[in-house]
Interface confidence: low
């Protein structure tokens, strides 16, 4: 069965940046990641990034920085302030759209007990949705 | 050739609900977004959202967030958005577009829906 | 979000003439700009994307430049057909569409 994991990580030398890794644990080919932060995208979700593998990559404030890492796994360096600034308990998505799996989704957060800087290994994440 | 084919126009009355159809061909519908855009009579062209049909992510303009709700059907290549609670202010021209390129603008529009808006 | 200021709202040039067009954005925009002809009636037409690329079909009259926050948009050799008004459209950080410029030829 597929898998998707995310993890949330807060830079030591800025506390309002975070970068946030996903990785899909599948076979299937990937057609579309999509990453959304205060819960699933179409969920009530608001999209930081979209990262499609031919056809480049659109990102939205305060997204500053959304790559691919590997073919099955991408990046995204969130800087912000006031509102638009995360914070430690905001809930971070990735959905990863593949053929022909279909579309796995998962979300992480800030450990509650990281310092700036560290962060827990790249686990799998519970699987919100699989359509 | 890609064409984008839109459901005819409308009239209805305040506080209702309408539903306007786009209907894709020539090129895969899963591989590019569809854009909604509104232009009231004599006035600019006003960005709602999109879509992206091979995945239903959304995105809306805050300006309509909980008033249009853009959906799929990847069986039949259609777009529709749905506008509810309706006003004379949502009389307009609604047109549905192609994304180009992830990075790029509309490079093909439908032809239009007709809104109106009366009692 | 990002506003685009789009001047002048409307303007009239003789036929063979040159109109330029400007748009500002609120903030740096990376040159994510397109430029759209829309006739009443009819769906807008694409002219140019990425502040300068024609895109395909498109006569090499039209033309555009900018960086920034300021780009500008122009017709040389004006034609009959040009009547129509011109939209600017920022796809940097979603979508915003300048308030547009009506062209007359005379």
């Known amino acids: 069965t597929p898998e998707v994991w995310v993890q949330v990580r807060m830079e030591a030398t800025e506390l309002s940046s975070f970068t946030i890794r996903c990785g899909f644990l599948g076979s299937g080919s990937i057609s579309l990641v999509t990453v959304s932060w205060g819960g699933p995208n179409g969920a009530g979700g608001t999209t930081l990034a979209v990262l499609h593998p031919e056809r480049g990559i659109r990102q939205w404030a305060p997204a500053r920085q959304a790559r691919w890492e590997t073919q099955s796994s991408i990046s995204l360096i969130l800087e912000g302030s006031g509102a638009s600034s995360p914070c430690a308990n905001t809930t971070f998505c990735c959905k990863f759209a593949s053929f022909p799996e279909g579309s796995w989704e998962a979300c992480g957060s800030l450990p509650p007990s990281s310092d700036p800087g560290l962060s827990a290994p790249p686990t799998p994440a519970p699987i919100l949705r699989a359509d | 050739q890609v064409h984008l084919h839109q459901s005819g126009p409308e009239l209805v009355k305040p506080g209702a609900s309408v539903k306007i159809s786009c209907k894709a061909s020539?090129?895969?519908?899963?591989?590019?977004?569809i854009n909604w855009v509104k232009q009231r009579p004599g006035q600019g062209l006003e960005w709602i959202g999109w879509?992206?049909?091979?995945?239903?992510?959304?995105y809306y303009n805050e300006k309509f967030k909980g008033r249009a709700t853009l959906t799929v059907d990847k069986s039949s290549s259609t777009a529709y958005m749905l506008l509810n609670s309706l006003t004379s202010e949502d009389s307009a021209v609604y047109f549905c577009?192609?994304?180009?390129?992830?990075?790029?603008?509309?490079?093909?529009w439908g032809q239009g829906t007709t809104l109106t808006v009366s009692s | 979000d990002i506003q685009m200021t789009q001047s002048p709202s409307s303007l009239s040039a003789s036929l063979g003439g040159k109109v330029t067009i400007t748009c500002k954005a609120s903030?740096?925009?990376?040159?994510?700009i397109a430029w759209y002809q829309h006739k009443p009636g009819k769906s807008p037409r694409l002219l140019i994307h990425?502040?300068?690329t024609l895109q395909a079909g498109i006569p090499s009259r039209f033309s555009g430049s900018g960086s920034g926050r300021d780009y500008s948009f122009s017709i040389s050799n004006l034609e009959p057909e040009d009547s129509a008004t011109y939209y600017c459209?920022?796809?940097?950080?979603?979508?915003?569409f300048g308030g547009g410029t009506k062209l007359e030829i005379k």
């Open positions: 577009a192609r994304d180009g390129e992830l990075r790029g603008p509309f490079d093909y």
């Open positions: 020539g090129y895969t519908f899963t591989a590019y977004y």
């Open positions: 879509i992206f049909p091979g995945s239903d992510s959304t």
């Open positions: 903030q740096d925009i990376n040159k994510y």
């Open positions: 990425y502040t300068s």
């Open positions: 459209l920022q796809y940097d950080n979603l979508l915003t």
